[in-house]
């Protein structure tokens, strides 16, 4: 969508304006995070055979990972900018607990996992500035998140490896869907 003059457009000669429009910045930020996820997935797939496993359904039952659905207004059919933006922000906020879980799951990529977490927080801030209807965004309950984290960390090794793989795969898919939707806004 075109940027209204004086907001974030490149032709505004403000002394300290951002070097990118907000839409460009969001697009690049998502791809930056996807780049980080692919580095983490590489370690996960090298370390275990989870990436080829057919037993994903077993672990998926423990998880309630955000997914795009038709009603969210992010797909081409039935596209709704405001509903979709709320879904993207809500979904990212819901992913935060899972990104926190990833923090202790990597030996050689500890900082990489932190990088994905931190760049996601920045993305949420960018998107919140774009959203008009912030009241519609529900923030996850911290107590619920804390007990979910405890539950995930108490799983056996196989389930923890599978959970890590599923989080990364789902987060990648969610970001890719978000990217496609945001390019229509």
């Amino acid at each position: 969508a075109p940027v209204p003059p004086g907001e974030d457009s490149k032709d505004v000669a403000a002394p300290h304006r951002q070097p990118l429009t907000s839409s460009e910045r969001i697009d690049k930020q998502i791809r930056y995070i996807l780049d980080g996820i692919s580095a983490l997935r590489k370690e996960t797939c090298n370390k275990s055979n989870m990436c080829e496993s057919s037993k994903e359904a077993l672990a998926e039952n423990n998880l309630n990972l955000p997914k795009m659905a038709e009603k969210d207004g992010c797909f081409q059919s039935g596209f709704n900018e405001e509903t979709c933006l709320v879904k993207i922000i809500t979904g990212l906020l819901e992913f935060e607990v899972y990104l926190e879980y990833l923090q202790n799951r990597f030996e050689s990529s500890e900082e990489q996992a932190r990088a994905v977490q931190m760049s996601t927080k920045v993305l949420i801030q960018f998107l919140q500035k774009k959203a008009k209807n912030l009241d519609a965004i529900t923030t996850p309950d911290p107590t619920t998140n804390a007990s979910l984290l405890t539950k995930l960390q108490a799983q056996n090794q196989w389930l923890q490896d599978m959970t890590t793989h599923l989080i990364l795969r789902s987060f990648k898919e969610f970001l890719q869907s978000s990217l496609r939707a945001l390019r229509q806004m």
């Epitope: 690049k28 050689s108 920045v122």
Partner: nanobody, 129 residues
């Protein structure tokens, strides 16, 4: 732990050139963002330029951004073999005189100093008229 060390500062004539270097060690993550900032006495740090780096060849890799005041005069680049990010400063002006810092973050497309996590100790640039 990530460490950044700047070098290449010094005295230059107006209209002259300097090349600043920032050696990065201890980085274990990708993608990453490196920025150059300048600070004049008694003033706040100002963003100068940014480059995005990645260990994978994506189209984000090597993405560069410049403050209006230096665009067309300064060039930011990186040399992965030497873990170095350079700032080539041409057509220098007296108002470019400042301490120049390089900084690193993995937060993405950020351009303000409070969003950077690791900092070098700075190198002084003085431009005489």
């Amino acid at each position: 732990q990530v460490q950044l060390v700047e070098s290449g500062g010094g005295l230059a004539q107006a209209g002259g050139s300097l090349r600043l270097s920032c050696v990065v060690s201890g980085r274990t993550f990708s993608p990453y963002t490196i920025g150059w900032f300048s600070q004049r006495p008694g003033k706040e740090r100002e963003w100068v330029a940014t480059i995005i780096g990645s260990d994978r060849s994506t189209d984000l890799d090597g993405d560069t951004y410049y403050a209006d005041s230096v665009r067309g005069r300064f060039t930011i680049s990186r040399n992965d073999a030497k873990n170095t990010v350079s700032l080539q400063m041409n057509s220098l002006k007296p108002e470019d005189s400042a301490v120049y810092y390089c900084a690193l973050t993995a937060k993405g497309y950020v351009f303000t100093d409070n969003e950077y996590d690791y900092w070098g100790q700075g190198t002084q640039v003085t431009v005489s008229s």
